[in-house]
């Protein structure tokens, strides 16, 4: 058993049929010694008396809010949560496996630049009685500070018969050094509590590996005289690190119709313009990637050919 | 050329070669398969490699003030990785595929380090740790980690030279 926060405790249980469970001793936070009784949740049934209560925690029926009273007055509470371990593996029932970029990916994180600011998100099908708490640091043995905000519900989607909820959190490294080569990864830890179930999820990454620039901005077309060709120009996204002579991007320019199966024109360039062949009913799209480190491509920015 | 006396390097040449290094480092990476390094106890095997850190003057402002500190750091790293790529970690079993870009990578690291420090001038170089994995699978894992680390190192070096070529070239 360990303390998650004041008056909230996590009991770690090996979860298998007829498991013996964990013996837990609760102590009433009071100077009183006599006439103390214990109850669980909203029940008035007295579970025991005395300053301490010893219980055998085996299942979710044994978890909940234990309250010690004296003469009708509440003295203190202890909330017990369960953390299940099945076959040596901690349960991951609360969050959905996003399976990208690999199996058992529950947290996904992205950064728009090298400023030390990043966003992480996760998915669940649970809609109520759900709380998240997020902590982060650079490195684990001698951690350097990363400040995270509160996790918020950022999107709701219908997936077949189920509703899926996306939560996200923004974090900022306290003393970021955008130009340096990272040697210690960022660690992100998410505590998830659903009713009386506790789970924790972690992710470890370098900012450089989660970079995904915003799409290029201000796409403009200029038809070339006596030619099917069009000069397309664009600018670096506002959110990208500066100066651009140092933090350079490379671009992919593509002309394609509405269907992915249609023919296309495609060219890669380090410049902020390119000449392509425009077709009726097609769109010109441009996306960006860090020029020197192969992290993710941005989403496409598009303009119609016409 | 960046010499200890403090003259400027051939920024444009360094830019071209460092960009080539980036391309080679990424084409060498798939050679050793895909695995998550952080699940493999990353710290103890690759924390000895030289990293370009915050105080090394490799940021745009630091380069404007005095590029020598940064260039010396890059030079140290290039020599370090050049020696690692020539060591038995890469030459031992399992043999690299004959078409491995590691050979080109090795030569290009040497080429860039020579551009930065011509014959006859000497910056102090960092000791190469004795990483001698006994098992072929350990060697494979170590190659992977070194190449991943090299990708990050050459990316910073390429940014430095691109910025230098754009803003510091005579």
């Amino acid at each position: 058993i360990w303390e998650l926060k004041k008056d909230v405790y996590v009991v770690e249980l090996d979860w298998y049929p007829d498991a013996p469970g964990e013996m837990v001793v609760l102590t009433c936070d009071t100077p009183e010694e006599d006439g103390i009784t214990w109850t669980l949740d909203q029940s008035s049934e007295v579970l025991g008396s005395g300053k301490t209560l010893t219980i055998q925690v085996k299942e979710f029926g044994d978890a909940g809010q234990y309250t010690c009273h004296k003469g009708g007055e509440v003295l203190s509470h202890s909330l017990l949560l369960l953390h299940k371990k099945e076959d040596g593996i901690w349960s991951t029932d609360i969050l959905k496996d996003q399976k990208e970029p690999k199996n058992k990916t529950f947290l996904r994180c992205e950064a728009k630049n090298y400023s030390g600011r990043f966003t992480c998100w996760w998915l669940t099908t649970i809609s109520t009685d759900l709380t998240f708490s997020v902590k982060s640091s650079r490195g684990s043995s001698d951690p350097q500070g990363v400040t995270c905000g509160a996790a918020t519900l950022s999107a709701e989607r219908v997936r077949g018969d189920n509703k899926e909820y996306e939560y996200s959190v923004e974090c900022q490294e306290d003393s970021a050094c955008p130009a340096a080569e990272e040697s210690l990864p960022i660690e992100v830890m998410v505590d998830a509590v659903h009713k009386l179930k506790y789970e924790n999820y972690t992710s470890s990454f370098f900012i450089r590996d989660i970079i995904k620039p915003d799409p290029p901005k201000n796409l403009q077309l200029k038809p070339l005289k006596n030619s099917r060709q069009v000069e397309v120009s664009w600018e670096y996204p506002d959110t990208w690190s500066t100066p651009h002579s140092y933090f350079s991007l490379t671009f992919c320019v593509q002309v394609q119709g509405k269907s992915k199966r249609e023919k296309k024109d495609r060219v890669f360039t380090d410049k902020t313009s390119a000449t392509v062949i425009c077709r009726k009913n097609a769109s010109i799209s441009v996306r960006a990637q860090d020029r020197y480190y192969s992290s993710s491509w941005s989403e496409w920015a598009s303009v119609p050919c016409s | 050329r960046a010499v200890p006396g403090g003259s400027s390097p051939a920024w444009t040449q360094c830019q071209q070669l460092s960009q080539k290094l980036c391309t080679l480092a990424w084409s060498a990476h798939p050679l050793v398969g895909h695995m998550d390094l952080r699940e493999e106890g990353d710290e103890e095997t690759t924390n000895d490699v030289p990293h370009i850190q915050c105080g090394d003057g490799c940021d745009p402002q630091g380069l404007r003030d005095n590029s020598q500190f940064c260039l010396q750091r890059i030079h140290q790293g290039l020599i370090f990785y050049e020696k690692l790529l020539g060591s038995d970690i890469f030459t031992g079993e399992p043999s690299l595929l004959p078409d491995s870009p590691v050979g080109q990578l090795h030569a290009s690291l040497l080429g860039l380090s020579q551009l930065l420090q011509p014959e006859g001038h000497h910056w102090e170089t960092q000791q190469i740790p004795s990483l001698s994995p006994s098992q072929p699978w350990q060697r494979l894992l170590l190659r992977f980690k070194i190449l991943r680390s090299l990708q990050a190192f050459v990316a910073v070096a390429a940014r430095v030279f691109a910025h230098g070529a754009a803003t510091l070239s005579p």
Epitope: T250, D265, R266, V267, D270, T275, R279, K280 | -
Partner: antibody, heavy 118, light 107 residues
Framework: EVQLVQSGAEVKKPGATVKISCKAS????????LHWVRQAPGKGLEWMGW????????EYAPKFQGKVTITADTSTDTGYLELSSLRSEDTAVYYC???????????WGQGTLVTVSS | DIQMTQSPSSVSASVGDRVTITCRAS??????LHWYQQKPGKAPKLLIK???QSISGVPSRFSGSGSGTDFSLTINSLQPEDFATYYC?????????FGGGTKVEIK
């Protein structure tokens, strides 16, 4: 299977015009760009131009502008290359090539030898 | 027009050898570079697209690398069927242009 089958060899006199064909099969003709590339005996490859069979748009290499005409007939899934004012240096193997991507060549015809000789 | 220069123009090698062919562009072309193989009397065949992307059905012994102005095609462990002429082609801008070719001959 995506295939391009070209018409047979031609022998022409200088100043004449020749029209060679390239019949596509195994795919929807208008879904691919069609290019023409030539190769003089013992020499390298030279790109001449392309056509989008869907709308008839064409683009030619400056060297061949006015010299060649590329057309396409979607009713027969056939592309054509017409070369005018033939000279001995136009003696070459002419290849048609196709791809869904405009700028490189995924599928090639077997080639048509055009010999210009008096 | 962008000029493409291949070297060497010919190379003699034995089965099992590793052969590297280089291609240099007269200006930066990012990764807009493709490689073809041509055997005598046959049409060219696409081997690599966009400098390093493999083509389905092409043996993995063919690999490409490079960006900007310098590119290479490597044939690992040359097979008897690999004796042919190899061409690079830039697609950075029109007109599309090819290198002069590199003939890989039996030693």
């Amino acid at each position: 299977e995506v295939q391009l089958v070209q018409s047979g060899a031609e022998v022409k006199k200088p100043g004449a015009t020749v029209k060679i064909s390239c019949k596509a099969s195994g795919y929807t003709f208008s879904d691919y760009y069609l290019h023409w590339v030539r190769q003089a005996p013992g020499k390298g490859l030279e790109w001449m131009g392309w056509i989008d069979p869907e709308n008839g748009d064409t683009e030619y290499a400056p060297k061949f502008q006015g010299k060649v005409t590329i057309t396409a007939d979607t009713s027969t899934d056939t592309g054509y290359l017409e070369l005018s004012s033939l000279r001995s240096e136009d003696t070459a193997v002419y290849y048609c090539a196709a791809n869904k991507e405009l700028r490189y060549f995924d599928v090639w015809g077997q080639g048509t030898l055009v010999t210009v000789s008096s | 027009d962008i000029q493409m220069t291949q070297s060497p123009s010919s190379v003699s090698a034995s089965v099992g050898d590793r052969v590297t062919i280089t291609c240099r562009a007269s200006q930066s072309i990012s990764i807009n570079l493709h490689w073809y193989q041509q055997k005598p009397g046959k049409a060219p065949k696409l081997l690599i697209k966009f400098a390093s992307q493999s083509i389905s059905g092409v043996p993995s012994r063919f690999s490409g690398s490079g960006s900007g102005t310098d590119f290479s095609l490597t044939i690992n462990s040359l097979q008897p069927e690999d004796f042919a002429t190899y061409y690079c082609q830039q697609s950075n801008s029109f007109p599309l242009t090819f290198g002069g070719g590199t003939k890989v001959e039996i030693k």
